[in-house]
């Protein structure tokens, strides 16, 4: 939860804000609820839809070192173990990522296994 100083009324200065909850589906426009003492507030917010990507904020992994280069594929791989997931994110326990062996080629890592729904 985020804590913010908001000058609203004389009694409340520190509001505690809950998560942004989309009004429909999993992302897009929604509301965030704040509390301060007995007071509550709802404000508009937006959950970006790009969090569905394998390496979004939903699933955080701790990675091993890169393995040796596989000559047959020209790639090297490493494994990641789940470190933290957003509460409702159905993240894989482990993922494997690959990248080209040559350090000259700048390429985004690709997940062979990522977040998946049951």
């Amino acid at each position: 939860k985020k804590k913010e100083k908001v000058k609203k009324g004389s009694e409340c200065s520190e509001w505690t804000w809950g998560p942004c909850t989309p009004s429909s589906k999993d992302c897009g426009m929604g509301f965030r609820e704040g509390t301060c003492g007995a007071q509550t507030q709802r404000v508009h917010c937006k959950v970006p839809c790009n969090w569905k990507k394998e390496f979004g904020a939903d699933c955080k992994y701790k990675f091993e070192s890169w393995g040796a280069c596989d000559g047959s594929t020209g790639t090297k791989a490493r494994q990641g173990t789940l470190k933290k997931a957003r509460y409702n994110a159905q993240c894989q326990e482990t993922i494997r990522v690959t990248k080209p062996c040559t350090s000259k080629t700048k390429s985004k890592t690709k997940a062979k296994k990522g977040k998946g729904k049951d």
Partner: antibody, heavy 117, light 107 residues
């Protein structure tokens, strides 16, 4: 599979404090949210809050903001619930549960806290 | 906070009958609704997660529907060991909240 073993419950005087423990074994303790839930005798379930062992991020039910403190000790694979200023209405069975959206959850056996003079 | 209202409070059935338990949320919670079974002196046991997702080890006679505000837990053919209290829980926003429970009892 995760096994959760709880301890620390018992009889406490009104106004007193108690620290409940939830020791995890099995799969990685540090990867999953740890919830604390209580159940008063003959009543329903009430969520106290949760903590993530990887970084101690804590989300607390506002009802318990002056009553409960959640902590973890990664080295011991243990989560703790500290309850302060206890009153008769805090008498309940307290449960911890480890939550993964992917595989579901695992619960401790529960520990009874009785607040009485 | 999101209020979950379960109905009926008590459901009396005979083994072999179909059970329909309802959980209504005070606002839309997408599919972030879970069902638990609790027997006396035991911890709750997760039956269904995210409205309709099955849980390993839970018999196939348990199924759930959603999403939105109206959710149902169905037991296709009640077995003697199913008589217990059933709770719904939402994880759409904090605080997490539970319904008041439905007691499934033997008729």
């Amino acid at each position: 599979q995760v096994q959760l073993v709880q301890s620390g419950g018992g009889l406490v005087q009104p106004g007193g404090s108690l620290r409940l423990s939830c020791a995890a074994s099995g799969q990685s303790f540090s990867s999953y949210w740890m919830n604390w839930v209580r159940q008063a005798p003959g009543q329903g379930l009430e969520w106290i809050g949760m903590i993530h062992p990887s970084d101690s991020e804590t989300i607390l039910n506002q009802k318990f903001k002056d009553k409960a403190t959640l902590t973890v000790d990664i080295s011991k694979n243990t989560a703790y619930l500290q309850m302060n200023s206890l009153r008769a209405e805090d008498t309940a069975v307290y449960y911890c549960s480890s939550w993964s959206a992917k595989r579901g959850d695992f619960w401790g056996q529960g520990t009874l806290v009785t607040v009485s003079s | 906070e999101i209020v979950l209202t379960q109905s009926p409070a008590t459901l009396s059935l005979s083994p072999g009958e179909r059970a329909n338990l309802s959980c209504r949320a005070s606002e839309s919670i997408s599919n972030n609704l879970h069902w638990y079974q609790q027997k006396p002196h035991q911890a709750p046991r997760l039956l269904i997660k995210y409205a309709s997702q099955s849980i390993s080890g839970i018999p196939a006679r348990f199924s759930g529907s959603g999403p939105g505000t109206d959710f149902n837990l169905t037991i296709s053919s009640v077995e003697p060991e199913d008589f217990a209290v059933y709770y719904c829980q939402q994880s759409n926003s904090w605080p997490l909240t539970f319904g008041g429970g439905t007691k499934l009892e033997i008729k």
